[in-house]
């Protein structure tokens, strides 16, 4: 379970049409459900219910986004449509280049993601909790344009990869 270094770049637009970028760093863990590799994409926030096998959404997504999913307390969904691993697979099937789960309210999900699948996903599946999860959700809840970059080593410079 290696450390995942996540950088989130938030874009704030000004009335003149220019963008100011804010970079926030946080850490999570690569789960065994996915690959330990780098990924980058625009953040798409998703409720876990939205990762059920519902074919009504097939037209909604392109490839290359990073799914951010805040898991609920298990008692809110006693009979989930899919396991957490199944939901990660569903996101990747829909075009996610990586999935980040906030497991703060469902810590049992960590074991589910780390059980080790015979057929792990070829994309990273990261989980965050505690202060890092709060930081991530504060950004995501702003509903602004944001990109996430996931790395398996600490970034050398927070903004080196971002070319305006």
């Amino acid at each position: 379970k290696e450390t995942a270094f996540v950088e989130v770049v938030l874009f704030e637009s000004s009335p003149s049409g220019d963008y100011t970028t804010y970079t926030t760093g946080l850490t999570g863990r690569f789960s065994r459900a996915g690959a330990t590799l780098s990924a980058e994409g625009e953040i798409v926030q998703m409720h876990p219910l939205g990762l059920c096998n519902n074919n009504d959404e097939e037209d909604l997504y392109e490839y290359g986004w990073v799914g951010v999913v805040k898991l609920e307390q298990p008692e809110l969904d006693p009979k989930p449509c899919l396991t957490v691993l199944g939901k990660a697979k569903r996101a990747v099937q829909r075009g996610a280049t990586a999935v980040i789960f906030d497991v703060s309210e469902n810590p049992e999900a960590i074991d589910q993601l780390n059980q080790g699948s015979e057929d792990p996903l070829k994309r990273p599946v990261v989980y965050v909790k505690g202060a890092d999860a709060i930081k991530l959700m504060n950004i995501v809840n702003k509903q602004k344009v944001a990109r996430a970059r996931i790395q398996h080593r600490p970034p050398r410079q927070p903004t080196e990869y971002f070319d305006m």
Partner: antibody
């Protein structure tokens, strides 16, 4: 903050068409579906259909199939709803609304466009 | 199409009252249910989605519960700004459909 700004009120004659625009700003345009919902005077809410801004895929309510067309212009982050063969019962406020965390749960709404159909 | 039935269609209540509105779907919609508040001349405002998840920025006096076909919106202590019309809406399958609305008036 995400904002959806709609075009102004329209008065149309029966049989005509109307095209309402909805310009998105302050958030990701391409990643969340935009729906159109209408509300006749003193009545409830009625979903007309939705468009996926990235792919342009549409789903329309059967009631409006053949009369409604939803399109988008990614260069201006704008979606459009055109309703043809207008009749008096199409007089309503038309809203565009954007998904938030969950498909079909609309956290962001335009201010509404009143379309009046009258001879 | 899935029919959504709200009750009551209107109710009178006082500031500080606990208010409960129910919504029933004609078939199971799992937890694909949202609640909206609408004031005259304004666009609806999302309060709850996924049956029980509070939308960011919505006061915690609003809560939702239910799964399958029966759902409830509760306002634990009614405030002056809560007098409005409330709608439930399913997004389990298209066409997405709304309840007919519940108007909460001042007693």
């Amino acid at each position: 903050q995400v904002q959806l700004v709609q075009s102004g009120a329209e008065v149309k004659k029966p049989g005509a068409s109307v095209k309402v625009s909805c310009k998105a700003s302050g958030g990701t345009f391409s990643s969340y579906a935009i729906s159109w919902v209408r509300q006749a005077p003193g009545q409830g809410l009625e979903w007309m259909g939705r468009i996926s801004p990235n792919r342009g895929g549409t789903k329309y309510a059967q009631k409006f199939q053949g009369r409604v067309t939803m399109t988008r212009d990614t260069s201006t982050s704008t979606v459009y709803m055109e309703l043809s063969s207008l009749r008096s019962e199409d007089t309503a406020v038309y809203y565009c609304a954007r998904d938030s965390w969950l498909r079909g749960a609309w956290g962001y709404w335009g201010q509404g466009t009143l379309v009046t159909v009258s001879s | 199409d899935i029919q959504m039935t709200q009750s009551p269609s209107s109710l009178s209540a006082s500031v500080g009252d606990r208010v409960t509105i129910t919504c029933r779907a004609s078939q199971s919609i799992s937890r694909w249910l949202a609640w909206y508040q609408q004031k005259p001349g304004k666009a609806p405002k999302l309060l709850i989605y996924a049956a029980s998840t509070l939308q960011s920025g919505v006061p915690s006096r609003f809560s939702g519960s239910g799964s399958g076909t029966d759902f409830t919106l509760t306002i634990s202590s009614l405030q002056p700004e809560d007098f409005a019309t409330y709608y439930c809406q399913q997004s389990f399958s298209t066409p997405y459909t709304f309840g007919q609305g519940t108007k909460v008036e001042i007693k």
